[in-house]
Interface confidence: medium
C-alpha cells in the first residue's frame, strides 16, 4: 500500500484541534502582483514581505510595492510600508539581509529617470526603523556585506565603480572605475577586476585582479590576463589567459593572491567553462566542460592546496555557462554529493557519492518501488533524482533536492525509477541515512519542508487546483496525517519555513481569486502543541554514520573517521526544541590506501587501491609551481585526501626536494604583481 | 492554430522499418511533449512514447523498446518516430499527440497532468508481404 | 504497468439521457487521468484531463470525477454527436496506458 496507508501507521492524537488553534490567516491588502519574503536574523521570529504590483501604462511602467513585517513567525503582519515613505521597491535586488544576528537590513529604491544617483532605506533594528539615504550612484547590484563587518557594503554601480561604505551605508565612496566583478574575502578583504580599454566584455581575458585589504586605501594588482574569478572555501581561484593562444587556465591562490600555483587541470577554449561546484577549507570540487555542445564535463577533486586534482566524474551534466546542473551537496551527512550524468545514450542518470567524489554509485533502488518503463531489465534499476536541470526543463518538479545539517541523515527529493531519469510525473523519495537507501515517501510532486531538526516533516501537493489541504509526518515519512487548514482552498505559490530547519512554523503561501479581486494570503501553522513534549534521552538511539558492514572493524570509516549521531526514534512523538544541537562521537580510524589520493602523474587503475605513475609521464621530471617557488616536485605518488582524519595504518611517506629549476608554468608569478596606494 | 500535421500512409514489408513525421504549428514546439499513440484496426489507442522537444530525452513503452526511436528537429518543430523490424501486427494507425504531461507551465491554472490536447491526423501504416 | 479496466464496453443510451462510463485503474493514478472522445475515421479529442478538468470547448454536459483507483465520465443529456468510443488514459506512471474503451450507441 502506498505511504501512510499502513494499518501500523499510528495517528497523532486530537492534532486537527491543536492545529486549528494554531492556524494563523493573514490576507493582504494587495493586488496580486509578486511576494518575496526575508527572514531577518536567527531565531527572532522576524519576516519581512515585500509585495510589489506592476500596472503598465502606454508610455511606462507604474509600479507599487507594499512592505509587511511579522514578529511571530508569520502569524501576524504589521503594513510598515509608511516606514519607507511608501516607495516602490526594486525587487530585482530583493531585501539585501546583514549577516548573522545583524538586525541590518538594505531595501533598494525606484527612483525617477533624471535623478543623479539611487536611493536605499536601512534599518539595524531587525526592519522596526528605517532610514532613508539618498546614493551618489546608480546601483547595479545588490548592496554586499562584509561577512567579518556587516556595517561595511559594497557595491557595483551602473558606470561600472565600485563604491565601498565603511558606515552602513550612511556615507559611500568611489575606491575604483571600470570593474566587472567584486567580492569580499576573508578579514574584510575585496578582490575584483578591472578593464583597461574598453568594457568588461570586450576586455574578458585581459582583466586584471585587484585586492584591497583596507577598503580601498591601498590596491595590490594580483592578477593580469584574467577571465575571471572566483573564491571558494580558503582558495581563490582565477582563469587566466594563455600566453599563446586563446586557451585560459586556472590558477589557484591560497594566501589571497600574493603567490599562486597553476591547478593540474585541463586548460579551456573560448567556448567551454570552468566551475567551482563546492568548495570548503580543506577541498574543491572543479567542473571542467568538455569541448564542443556536449551538455557535459568532468569533475576534478582538489587535494589540500587546490593544485593537484584527482579525475571525480565523467560526462557530468551541466549544460552551459550559468546553465543547470543538478550537483547537489547533501549537507545531512558528512561526505555525501549527489548529481547527474549524461550517459553515452543521452539519457540522464543520478550518481552519488559517500567520500567526496572518490567514488561514485547509482542510487540504490528503494525497497517499494517498481521499476519504470526507462528500465530494461525490471527487476534491477535504481533510482534518479530530479533536481536543477529537471525543473529547468519544465519537467513537473516543484523542488530540489532537500536535506538539513541539523536532521542528520534526511535527504527528500523527487525522483522516478529506472534506468534513467523519466520524463513521468515523479513522486517523493526520502532516506534516512544521508542516501544509502530510499523509500518512496509521497506519490506525486510535492512541496515539502523539514521542521524542528527532523521532528516534523511536512508537505503540500503540487496541483493544478486551489488547494486546502496540509501533510505532515512525525516519523522521518513512514506515516502522513493530513489537516485541512482552511474552508476555502488557495491557489498555492509557496512554503515557507525559518532557513536553518529548527522551527515549528510553517507558513503557507497563496493567492485567492474571486470574479474581481486577487489577493495575497499566507497561513502559519504553529506545530508546537503536535509535540506536546521535550524530547528526552530515551528518545533518542546511537546510530553509526555510513554503516554499510556491521561485522567488519572499519564500518562507517569515512575519510579517515566514523560518526556516531543521536538520533530522534521515529516512534518518539517530542520536540528537538529551537537550542537542539547534534551530538555525534567521532573516532579515528586506521589509514588504509583508500585514504590517500594520486599525486600528479599517478592514477588509479580501475578496481585497484594501488596509484600507479602514469605511462606518458615515467621517467619525466613533474613540474609545476608550488607557492610561487620553483620547484622540482619527486613523489611515491600519493598525498592524504583533505580532510581525512586517519591515523595509523598504511602511510605512504612523500619527499619533496628544492631545485633552482625555473618555473615556466605560472602566468601569475610575483615578478606580475605590483602595489599602489590611493 | 495550434495543429500537428502528419506525413502521408506508408505501405510497408515484414522487417523493413517506417519513419512517421510530425509536424507542429501554432505554438512554442520546445514547451510541450510529444507522444506517439497508436491504434490497430478495430482496436483501441495503445501509448508508444513520449520525447521531449528540449533535450530530445525519450521514454518509450516497453514493449516498443529497441524497436522505436523518437527524434526530433527544433529546427523545423517536427517531430519523428521511426520503428524498425515490422511485423503484420504493427499495422495501425499511428497518431502524433500534444502532450504536456510532466511540464508545467506558468501560471497556477496550468500544472499538473493536462492529457494529450492537440492530435495529428493519424498516419496508416500497413505492414504486408 | 498500470492496467486501466473501462466498463461496460458498450452502452446503449436513448439521445437526452444520462450516460455514465467507469474507469478504473489497477494502481492508484491520483487525479493523473484524461478521458478522450474517437468517432469513426477521427484522431481521439480530449474532453477532461486531472480527472475532473473540462477541456477548452467541451460541454458542460461531459463532467469527470473520482481521484486513486475510481473514475467516472458523466454525459449529463446525450446529444446525437456523443455517440462515440470513449477512452480513459492514465499519466500517474509510465507507460501510459489506455483503458480499452466504452462504445456509446443509441439505444
Known amino acids: 500500500s502506498a505511504p501512510g496507508e499502513d494499518e501500523e501507521c499510528g495517528r497523532v492524537r486530537d492534532f486537527v484541534a491543536k492545529l486549528a488553534n494554531n492556524t494563523h490567516q493573514h490576507v493582504f491588502d494587495d493586488l496580486r502582483g509578486s511576494v518575496s519574503l526575508s527572514w531577518v536574523g536567527d531565531s527572532t521570529g522576524v519576516i519581512l514581505v515585500l509585495t510589489t504590483f506592476h500596472v503598465p501604462l502606454v508610455i511606462m511602467t507604474f509600479g507599487q510595492s507594499k512592505l509587511y513585517r511579522s514578529e511571530d513567525y508569520g502569524k501576524n503582519f504589521k503594513d510598515i510600508t509608511d516606514l519607507i515613505n511608501n516607495t516602490f521597491i526594486r525587487t530585482e535586488f530583493g531585501m539585501a539581509i546583514g549577516p548573522e544576528n545583524s538586525g541590518k537590513v538594505v531595501l533598494t529604491a525606484e527612483v525617477s529617470g533624471g535623478s543623479r544617483g539611487g536611493r536605499i532605506f536601512r534599518s539595524s533594528d531587525f526592519a522596526k526603523n528605517f532610514v532613508q539615504t539618498d546614493l551618489p550612484f546608480h546601483p547595479l547590484t545588490q548592496m554586499m556585506y562584509s561577512p567579518q563587518n556587516s556595517d561595511y557594503l559594497l557595491a557595483l554601480s551602473t558606470e561600472n565603480g565600485l563604491w565601498v561604505s565603511k558606515n552602513f551605508g550612511g556615507k559611500w565612496e568611489e575606491i575604483h572605475k571600470a570593474v566587472c566583478l567584486a567580492k569580499w574575502g576573508s578579514d574584510n578583504t575585496i578582490f575584483f577586476t578591472t578593464y583597461a580599454n574598453g568594457s568588461c566584455k570586450a576586455d574578458l581575458g585581459a582583466l586584471e585582479l585587484w585586492r584591497t585589504s583596507d577598503l580601498g586605501k591601498s590596491f595590490k594588482t594580483i592578477g593580469v590576463k584574467i577571465y575571471s574569478f572566483g573564491l571558494g572555501g580558503r582558495f581563490l581561484f582565477a582563469s587566466v589567459m594563455a600566453d599563446k593562444d586563446t586557451t585560459r587556465r586556472i590558477h589557484v591562490s591560497t594566501d589571497q593572491g600574493d603567490t599562486w600555483s597553476m591547478a593540474q587541470l585541463p586548460s579551456v577554449g573560448q567556448e567551454q567553462f570552468y566551475s567551482i561546484l563546492a568548495a570548503n577549507d580543506d577541498m574543491v570540487f572543479m567542473h571542467v566542460d568538455e569541448p564542443g555542445d556536449t551538455g557535459f564535463g568532468t569533475i576534478f577533486t582538489s587535494d589540500d592546496r587546490g593544485i593537484v586534482y584527482s579525475k571525480s566524474l565523467d560526462r557530468h551534466l551541466y549544460t552551459t555557462t550559468g546553465g543547470e546542473t543538478d550537483f547537489t551537496n547533501v549537507t545531512s551527512l558528512r561526505g555525501v554529493y549527489i548529481t547527474s550524468v549524461l550517459s553515452e545514450d543521452n539519457s540522464i542518470q543520478t550518481m552519488i557519492t559517500f567520500d567526496q567524489g572518490g567514488r561514485w554509485t547509482h542510487l540504490r533502488k528503494p525497497e517499494n518501488s517498481e521499476c519504470d518503463a526507462t528500465a530494461k531489465n525490471k527487476n534491477e534499476c535504481s533510482l534518479h533524482i530530479h533536481a536543477s536541470y529537471s525543473i529547468s526543463q519544465k519537467l513537473n518538479v516543484p523542488m530540489a533536492p532537500l536535506s538539513e545539517p541539523n536532521a542528520v541523515g534526511i535527504v527528500i527529493a523527487h525522483g522516478s525509477v529506472g534506468d534513467a531519469i523519466s520524463v513521468m510525473v515523479p513522486d517523493v523519495y526520502i532516506s534516512d541515512d544521508g542516501g544509502y537507501s530510499w523509500t518512496k515517501m509521497l506519490e506525486g510532486p510535492h512541496y515539502y519542508t523539514i521542521l524542528d531538526s527532523g521532528g516534523i516533516i511536512v508537505a503540500i501537493e503540487h496541483s493544478s487546483r486551489p488547494i486546502n489541504v496540509i501533510k505532515f509526518s512525525t516519523d522521518e515519512g513512514q506515516c502522513w496525517q493530513t489537516y485541512t487548514f482552511t474552508r476555502d482552498p488557495i491557489y498555492f505559490t509557496g512554503l515557507a519555513s525559518e532557513p536553518g530547519a529548527r522551527s515549528m512554523n510553517i507558513s503557507i503561501w497563496g493567492f485567492t481569486e474571486s470574479f474581481l479581486t486577487s489577493q495575497w494570503v499566507s497561513y502559519t501553522i504553529d506545530f508546537k502543541d503536535i509535540l506536546e513534549r521535550n524530547c528526552e534521552e530515551k528518545d533518542y538511539t546511537i546510530w553509526l554514520a555510513h554503516s554499510t558492514d556491521p561485522e567488519d572493524y572499519e564500518d562507517g570509516c569515512i575519510l579517515g573517521y566514523k560518526e556516531q549521531f543521536l538520533r530522534l526514534r521515529k516512534s518518539s512523538v517530542c520536540q528537538n526544541g529551537r537550542d537542539y544541537v547534534v551530538t555525534k562521537q567521532p573516532s579515528i580510524c586506521l589509514c588504509s590506501l583508500e585514504d590517500f589520493l594520486c599525486d600528479f602523474g599517478y592514477y588509479r587503475p580501475e578496481n585497484d587501491s594501488k596509484c600507479v605513475e602514469q605511462p606518458e609521464l615515467k621517467g619525466h621530471d613533474l613540474e609545476f609551481c608550488l607557492y610561487g617557488r620553483e620547484e622540482h616536485l619527486t613523489t611515491n605518488g600519493y598525498r592524504k585526501i583533505p580532510g581525512d582524519k586517519c591515523q595509523g595504518g598504511v602511510n605512504p611517506v612523500r619527499e619533496v626536494k628544492d631545485l633552482k629549476k625555473k618555473c615556466t608554468s605560472n602566468f601569475l608569478s610575483p615578478e606580475k604583481q605590483n602595489s599602489k596606494s590611493n | 492554430q495550434v495543429q500537428l500535421v502528419q506525413s502521408g500512409a506508408e505501405v510497408k514489408k515484414p522487417g523493413a522499418s517506417v519513419k512517421v513525421s510530425c509536424k507542429a504549428s501554432?505554438?512554442?514546439?520546445?514547451?510541450?511533449?510529444m507522444s506517439w499513440v497508436r491504434q490497430a484496426p478495430g482496436q483501441g489507442l495503445e501509448w508508444m512514447g513520449i520525447?521531449?522537444?528540449?533535450?530530445?530525452?525519450?521514454s518509450y513503452a516497453q514493449k516498443f523498446q529497441g524497436r522505436v526511436t523518437m527524434t526530433r528537429d527544433t529546427s523545423t518543430s517536427t517531430v519523428y518516430m521511426e520503428l524498425s523490424s515490422l511485423r503484420s501486427e504493427d499495422t495501425a494507425v499511428y497518431y502524433c499527440?500534444?502532450?504536456?504531461?510532466?511540464?508545467?507551465?506558468?501560471?497556477?491554472?496550468?500544472?499538473?497532468?493536462?492529457?494529450?490536447?492537440?492530435w495529428g491526423q493519424g498516419t496508416t501504416v500497413t505492414v504486408s508481404s | 504497468e498500470i492496467v486501466m479496466t473501462q466498463s461496460p464496453a458498450t452502452l446503449s443510451v436513448s439521445p437526452g439521457e444520462r450516460a455514465t462510463l467507469s474507469c478504473r485503474a489497477s494502481?492508484?493514478?491520483?487525479?493523473?487521468l484524461a478521458w478522450y472522445q474517437q468517432k469513426p475515421g477521427q484522431a481521439p479529442r480530449l474532453l477532461i484531463y486531472?480527472?475532473?478538468t473540462r477541456a477548452t470547448g467541451i460541454p458542460a454536459r461531459f463532467s469527470g470525477s473520482g481521484s486513486g483507483t475510481e473514475f467516472t465520465l458523466t454525459i449529463s443529456s446525450l446529444q446525437s454527436e456523443d455517440f462515440a468510443v470513449y477512452y480513459c488514459?492514465?499519466?500517474?506512471?509510465?507507460?501510459?496506458?489506455f483503458g480499452g474503451g466504452t462504445k456509446v450507441e443509441i439505444k
Open positions: 499527440a500534444r502532450d504536456p504531461s510532466g511540464i508545467a507551465l506558468a501560471g497556477p491554472a496550468s500544472r499538473g497532468y493536462q492529457g494529450m490536447d492537440v
Open positions: 501554432g505554438y512554442t514546439f520546445t514547451k510541450y511533449y
Open positions: 520525447i521531449n522537444p528540449i533535450g530530445g530525452s525519450t
Open positions: 494502481q492508484s493514478v491520483s487525479s493523473n
Open positions: 486531472g480527472a475532473s
Open positions: 488514459q492514465q499519466a500517474r506512471l509510465g507507460p501510459w496506458t
